[in-house]
């Protein structure tokens, strides 16, 4: 049975030209994290594999930095970066947990971080 939950930074906003950290945390499970995928809608941004290290998609390599931890740092933000981001945790023996973050990139300087909050986990058990 999958008992884990994914905690994310939730809904966040940032200024155009700035940077933002996308962060998820898996809790309430002793499952081993083997890989974390970061996706924007259906587009792969990066993979962090426990044994192989990071793969940053070539399309994003100039403005995506690995970390901190299993998180991802997006740099040189544009309005086009607004949208949904997903952290997909592959774990053993539980299977897959998915967290969602919504990022809004703002033109003005009124960008504020949303409060950190917990979302229900979605999973595909393999």
């Amino acid at each position: 049975m999958m008992t884990g939950t994914i905690e994310t930074t939730g809904n966040i906003s940032a200024e155009k030209g700035g940077s933002i950290i996308l962060q998820c945390h898996l809790s309430s499970t002793t499952a081993q994290v083997t890989q974390v995928n970061w996706e924007q809608q259906d587009q792969l941004l990066a993979i962090c594999n426990a044994d192989l290290g990071w793969h940053i998609s070539p399309s994003f390599k100039d403005r995506v930095a690995p970390g901190p931890g299993l998180g991802l740092t997006l740099q040189s933000l544009t309005v086009n970066d607004t949208g949904e981001y997903f952290c997909i945790y592959h774990t053993y023996p539980d299977g897959t947990y998915t967290g969602r973050i919504f990022l809004e990139v703002l033109e003005s300087s009124v960008a504020e971080h949303g409060a950190r909050f917990q979302i229900p986990h979605h999973h595909h058990h393999h």
Partner: antibody
Framework: EVQLVQSGAEVKKPGASVKVSCKAS????????MHWVRQAPGQRLEWMGR????????KYNEKFKSRVTITVDKLSSTAYMELSSLRSEDTAVYYC????????????WGQGTTVTVSS | DIVMTQSPDSLAVSLGERATINCRVS??????LAWYQQKPGQSPKLLVY???TLAEGVPDRFSGSGSGTDFTLTISSLQAEDVAVYYC?????????FGPGTKVDIK
């Protein structure tokens, strides 16, 4: 057009070292990780390690960790694989291979470099 | 290490007929499996990644399927130029490992 051009065949004595080069062209060298894979005669392919040409960070197959070093020269868009303490079982074709867009597989391969270890 | 096995070791198929190659993996790798084609004296060529995504420029007679521990590469209508050895490879952990290969010939 993506091209990976490797250095020529080498014959080495047991205990020696070999350094194989792989010159990349047709794409932004620092945007794609590079892998090294070898194939001994009649054997399956065997992964040796990978490197991020941008940062120089590398990961190795534990089997080769003490003997292999993968490096890059960003200025010349060239990756290198050095294998030390050679033995006869290291006789193989050595390939460099570019990592794909969506993960740790390889989408383009060099032509291969034959390394023969013989006394 | 993740162990990859392939079946059959070799197969001979008539031109225009279907060829099916299986790859079994010792543990769950989700869909992180690639297939390569290697012709004699040549480098491997990527056919499929993520179990079912066809690489750029690969004819659509090739297709991949499966997830978890069991995967299949299918050539729907074998052509003369498809004579080669086919390897599966997981792209999920260290070390990346390959299957022993399946040799495909014309009957």
């Amino acid at each position: 057009e993506v091209q990976l051009v490797q250095s020529g065949a080498e014959v080495k004595k047991p205990g020696a070292s070999v350094k194989v080069s792989c010159k990349a062209s047709g794409y932004t060298f620092t945007n794609y990780y590079m892998h090294w894979v070898r194939q001994a005669p009649g054997q399956r392919l065997e992964w040796m390690g990978r490197i991020d040409p941008d940062s120089g960070g590398s990961k190795y197959n534990e089997k080769f960790k003490s003997r292999v070093t993968i490096t890059v020269d960003k200025l010349s868009s060239t990756a290198y694989m050095e294998l030390s303490s050679l033995r006869s079982e290291d006789t193989a074709v050595y390939y460099c291979a570019r990592e794909g867009h969506y993960g740790f597989y390889s989408d383009y391969w060099g032509q291969g470099t034959t390394v023969t270890v013989s006394s | 290490d993740i162990v990859m096995t392939q079946s059959p070791d070799s197969l001979a198929v008539s031109l225009g007929e279907r060829a099916t190659i299986n790859c079994r993996v010792s543990e769950n790798i989700y869909s992180y499996l690639a297939w390569y084609q290697q012709k004699p004296g040549q480098s491997p060529k990527l056919l499929v990644y993520n179990a079912k995504t066809l690489a750029e420029g690969v004819p659509d007679r090739f297709s991949g399927s499966g997830s978890g521990t069991d995967f299949t590469l299918t050539i729907s209508s074998l052509q003369a130029e498809d004579v080669a050895v086919y390897y599966c490879q997981h792209h999920y952990g260290n070390p990346l490992t390959f299957g022993p290969g399946t040799k495909v010939d014309i009957k």
